[in-house]
């Protein structure tokens, strides 16, 4: 059960809401974006204040972590069984510190199971954040600090903070140290989408959400 | 392979301005910035400043600031830099040097052959 | 701005000898030190970057270590062809700063 299930049984506020594994009864919580491009939008990463650290552990981005209510990882699990289930579409949506905004859509999106580290696969990619994906293509598997999948002799995670599809060490990085207006150019470690807003700039607010292609 | 190829020598008089190029083959320009570097006779280097070959987007060394413009042609993918009010203390050899933009990675490789600007009346 | 400070400003150390030079930073810069060789009349030539990740095609006689403020280049074997200057390079914000350079002599 999804976002997208949930907005089709009528509750169609955002907010968080239970969602459960496929073929499971594990559940998790989530915010559910009903609002933006007609809803039913499952929110599997959010910063906006910097109030919760993203250089975590491998367990912790398996699992998830943070508050659906503010910033937080939905937990790669998650997003990889439910994504092996059906077509999902992934969709970016980005903030600068000038009042900005900017998005990224991607047709295709899922996330391989964690015996091939989580790595992420994309195609189709429109929207207002750049012509060319700021996340690399083919897609890397995912590493953090504990755990180093990059394709960099160096190690991606702990240079440039938090968990991600480092290539190596590529153009993104959602999930990089949070700084403050006035203090986010000329950040090589922060919240990176290169082909908006170009290296050293860390973004103000970030979401990614994903749902079903055929909702 | 990657290149980096810079224009030839370059002998200025006190208060004149110069123009040196610097033009990349081998790879794609708007992944990659550079960072403008200069070594007088028999001293250290000294960075001048930084320009994005994706957005152009510049930094530039605080002493340089004002004097200094960095620029970038993408359609040659050739990267430029203009030093103006030259003085006697600017004879150097000036290198460009890419690094890897979009990683945010700021070390230099590969370099360019230099250019000697010579600043004398 | 971060100020890099190399030693010894100089050394000369014989065809198989080790040579250690150090760099250190004015504030902490996790990993983000590159270092590089120059010799008489050409460009500098990236080593090693990421503190200690040898660049493609440099000799594993090279190595680098240390992080935060402290930093080490290490010449194992020393090799004629090893003269020239070295310099370390700060990566963890503009403005880049250089340390004064470390010339290695061949004895």
């Known amino acids: 059960r999804d976002c997208a299930e949930i907005f089709k049984s009528g509750l169609t506020t955002s907010g968080i809401y239970t969602l459960t594994f496929p073929n499971s009864t594990e559940e998790i919580k989530a915010y559910c974006d009903m609002d933006v491009g007609g809803g039913g939008w499952t929110v599997i990463q959010h910063r906006e204040d910097g109030s919760v650290d993203f250089q975590r552990t491998w367990k912790e981005y398996k699992e998830g972590f943070g508050s659906p209510l503010g910033e937080y990882w939905l937990g790669n699990e998650f997003v990889s069984q439910l994504t092996g289930q059906h077509r999902y579409v992934l969709k970016i949506q980005l903030k600068d510190w000038e009042g900005n905004e900017a998005h990224s859509l991607y047709d295709h999106f899922y996330l391989a199971g964690e015996e091939s580290n989580y790595r992420i696969h994309l195609t189709g990619l429109t929207g207002t954040a750049g012509k060319i994906s700021s996340i690399s293509q083919p897609g890397s598997d995912f590493s953090t600090k504990d755990s180093d999948n990059d394709k960099c002799i160096c190690k991606c995670s702990q240079m440039l903070s938090g968990g991600w599809w480092f290539d190596a060490c590529g153009p993104s990085n959602l999930n990089g140290q949070y700084y403050p207006q006035k203090q986010n150019t000329n950040k090589f470690n922060g919240i990176k989408w290169y082909y908006w807003k170009g290296s050293g700039y860390s973004l103000k607010a970030t979401t990614m959400m994903i749902r079903p292609a055929d909702f | 392979q990657v290149q980096l190829v810079q224009s030839g020598v370059e002998v200025k008089k006190p208060g004149a301005s110069v123009k040196v190029s610097c033009k990349t083959s081998?790879?794609?320009?708007?992944?990659?910035?550079f960072s403008w570097v200069r070594q007088a006779p028999g001293q250290g280097l000294e960075w001048l400043g930084w320009?994005?070959?994706?957005?152009?987007?510049?930094n530039y060394a605080q002493k340089f600031q004002g004097r200094v413009t960095m620029t970038t042609d993408t359609s040659t993918s050739t990267a430029y830099m203009e030093l103006r009010t030259l003085r006697s203390d600017d004879t150097a050899v000036y290198y460009c040097?890419?690094?890897?933009?979009?990683?945010?990675?700021?070390?230099?490789?590969?370099w360019g052959q230099g250019t000697l600007v010579t600043v004398a009346s | 701005d971060i100020q890099m400070t190399q030693s010894p400003s100089s050394v000369s150390a014989s065809v198989g000898d080790r040579v250690i030079i150090t760099c250190r930073a004015s504030?902490?810069?996790?990993?983000?030190l590159a270092w590089y060789q120059q010799k008489p009349g050409t460009a500098p030539k990236l080593l090693i970057h990421?503190?200690?990740s040898l660049q493609t095609g440099v000799p594993s006689r090279f190595s680098g270590s240390g992080s935060g403020t402290e930093f080490a280049l290490t010449i194992n074997s020393l090799q004629p062809e090893d003269f020239g200057t070295y310099y370390c390079?700060?990566?963890?914000?503009?403005?880049?700063?250089f340390g004064g350079g470390t010339r290695v002599e061949i004895k």
């Open positions: 040097a890419r690094d890897q933009d979009y990683s945010n990675f700021h070390w230099l490789d590969p």
């Open positions: 081998g790879y794609t320009f708007s992944n990659n910035g």
């Open positions: 320009i994005s070959g994706y957005n152009g987007n510049t």
């Open positions: 504030q902490g810069l996790s990993s983000w």
């Open positions: 990421s503190a200690s």
């Open positions: 390079q700060q990566a963890n914000s503009f403005p880049l700063t």
